[in-house]
């Protein structure tokens, strides 16, 4: 039977989405006890019928992986948890409408960066996402994201940076103190899903200069 | 079996506010979104706005926005649509009907008339 | 906002015969995800609530007789009750859900000639 109010046994239902991989989360209520168990359903808008997620059914873990199941980018997704305590009772929460699209961060990219003399260089590497072409091979974010662009910075001192940015992988900044410590940063931006991500941060040292020993 | 049941209609005067309730039962109302939608008298269908009963997240038509809201009581399976500032042209019998799309299940309605 | 045209207004016909209302949309209801319409039909009898006949254009809603069906695609949209029955007079709404907010037809009253 349902609890007087099902926030009694289940909080929180939402979507956690990072470079598309999509997982199910939830919370117990105040009631909710560690046998509590959980059962998953999905579906996608407008559709009458909820599909049980298999390996979601009644488990004690509070998240489910949904990746593969939301995978359409173009598409609008719901997730639903229901909870039955070691009473009985039961409560049943949905999610908001997910559209991966819009809704997955992004985290920081792959980067290597290079150290030379006078110049550090910062390649960086294609995001591989969980999201399948036709022909079954794995997208990039940036095959995802048409305007997808890297800004670089790079901390000189307290007071100057510089900047580069691009939709290219390889970037170096010249004209550096050799023998001296930056701090870079690089970012992914999407503008048109208004998506930025997280910075990676390395903390790199121009070589000394043989040249005058 | 699903079942919604409106109230709180009646009569009201202009600049007058009003709650109505839709009661839901036959299944726990934060399963399925829920909507209200509004026919005046001898006229055609008009959506009002959704709520994820769940989440409490709404969705308005921007014709109603400001002026209506939706709301839930979890705990009492119900649905709420609060309605300030009335007019005479918000007379009308006002249900609610289930689901996120089209609408699978209707109340019966419940007929607002403001007037002086 | 989606504009929904419904015509005619009012259609009379004889006991047996095919009654078919025509939906216009402003624009098209194809759902690129799925390749479905998002169009649904109602049936509403006088002094009761409307009761869903039909979803996604042509999928008939578990429970409603198979005389009627709906078809069309992008703009255009037809219901088709094959064969009228005293039971079916009644006013019949088309509802668009592609896009917020949800619009109506502006419903099409059948009645029997």
């Known amino acids: 039977h349902a609890p007087e109010d099902p926030s009694d046994l289940l909080q929180h239902v939402k979507f956690q989405s990072s470079n598309f991989e999509n997982i199910l989360t939830w919370d117990s209520g105040p009631e909710g006890t560690p046998d509590t168990v959980y059962s998953i359903e999905y579906k996608t808008y407008g559709e009458r019928d909820w599909v049980a997620k298999k390996g979601c059914q009644r488990i004690t873990r509070k998240s489910c992986n949904l990746t593969v199941e939301t995978g359409n980018l173009t598409e609008l997704y719901y997730a639903r948890v229901t909870a039955v305590s070691a009473g009985g009772r039961s409560a049943t929460k949905m999610t908001d409408r997910f559209s991966s699209l819009q809704h997955t961060t992004l985290k920081p990219p792959d980067v290597t960066c290079i150290s030379k003399v006078r110049s550090i260089q910062m390649i960086v590497h294609p995001t591989p996402t969980p999201i399948r072409a036709g022909d079954g091979h794995r997208l990039t974010l940036e095959d995802i994201f048409h305007d997808l662009f890297y800004h670089l910075e790079l901390q000189v001192n307290r007071t100057y940076q510089m900047h580069l940015g691009g939709k290219q992988r390889e970037y170096e900044f010249f004209g550096l103190t050799p023998d001296t410590e930056f701090l870079g940063t690089i970012m992914i931006c999407v503008p048109t899903w208004a998506k930025e991500s997280a910075p990676y941060m390395c903390r790199v040292k121009t070589l000394p200069d043989r040249t005058w020993t | 079996e699903v079942q919604l049941v409106e109230s709180g209609g009646g009569l009201v005067q202009p600049g007058g506010s009003l709650r109505l309730s839709c009661a839901a039962s036959?299944?726990?109302?934060?399963?399925?979104?829920m909507n209200w939608v509004r026919q005046a008298p001898g006229k055609g269908l008009e959506w009002i706005g959704e709520?994820?009963?769940?989440?409490?997240?709404?969705t308005y038509n921007q014709k109603f926005k400001g002026r209506f809201t939706i709301s839930v009581d979890q705990s009492k399976n119900t649905a709420y649509l609060q309605m300030n500032s009335l007019r005479a042209e918000d007379t009308a019998v006002y249900y609610c009907?289930?689901?996120?799309?089209?609408?699978?299940?209707w109340g019966q309605g419940t007929l607002v008339t403001v007037s002086s | 906002d989606i504009v929904m045209t419904q015509s005619p207004d009012s259609l009379a016909v004889s006991l047996g015969e095919r009654a078919t209302i025509n939906c216009k949309s402003s624009?098209?209801?194809?759902?690129?995800?799925?390749?479905?319409?998002?169009l649904a039909w109602y049936q509403q009898k006088p002094g009761q609530p409307p009761k869903l006949l039909i979803y996604?254009?042509?999928s008939r809603e578990s429970g409603v007789p198979d005389r009627f069906s709906g078809s069309g695609s992008g703009t255009d949209f037809t219901l088709t009750i094959s064969s009228l029955q005293a039971e079916d007079v009644a006013v019949y709404y088309c509802?668009?859900?592609?896009?917020?907010?949800?619009?109506f037809g502006q419903g099409t009253k059948v009645e029997i000639k």
């Open positions: 036959g299944y726990s109302i934060t399963a399925e979104y």
């Open positions: 624009q098209s209801l194809l759902y690129s995800s799925n390749q479905k319409n998002t």
């Open positions: 009907a289930r689901f996120d799309a089209y609408f699978d299940y």
């Open positions: 509802q668009q859900y592609y896009s917020y907010p949800f619009t």
């Open positions: 996604w254009a042509s």
């Open positions: 709520i994820n009963p769940s989440t409490g997240t709404t």
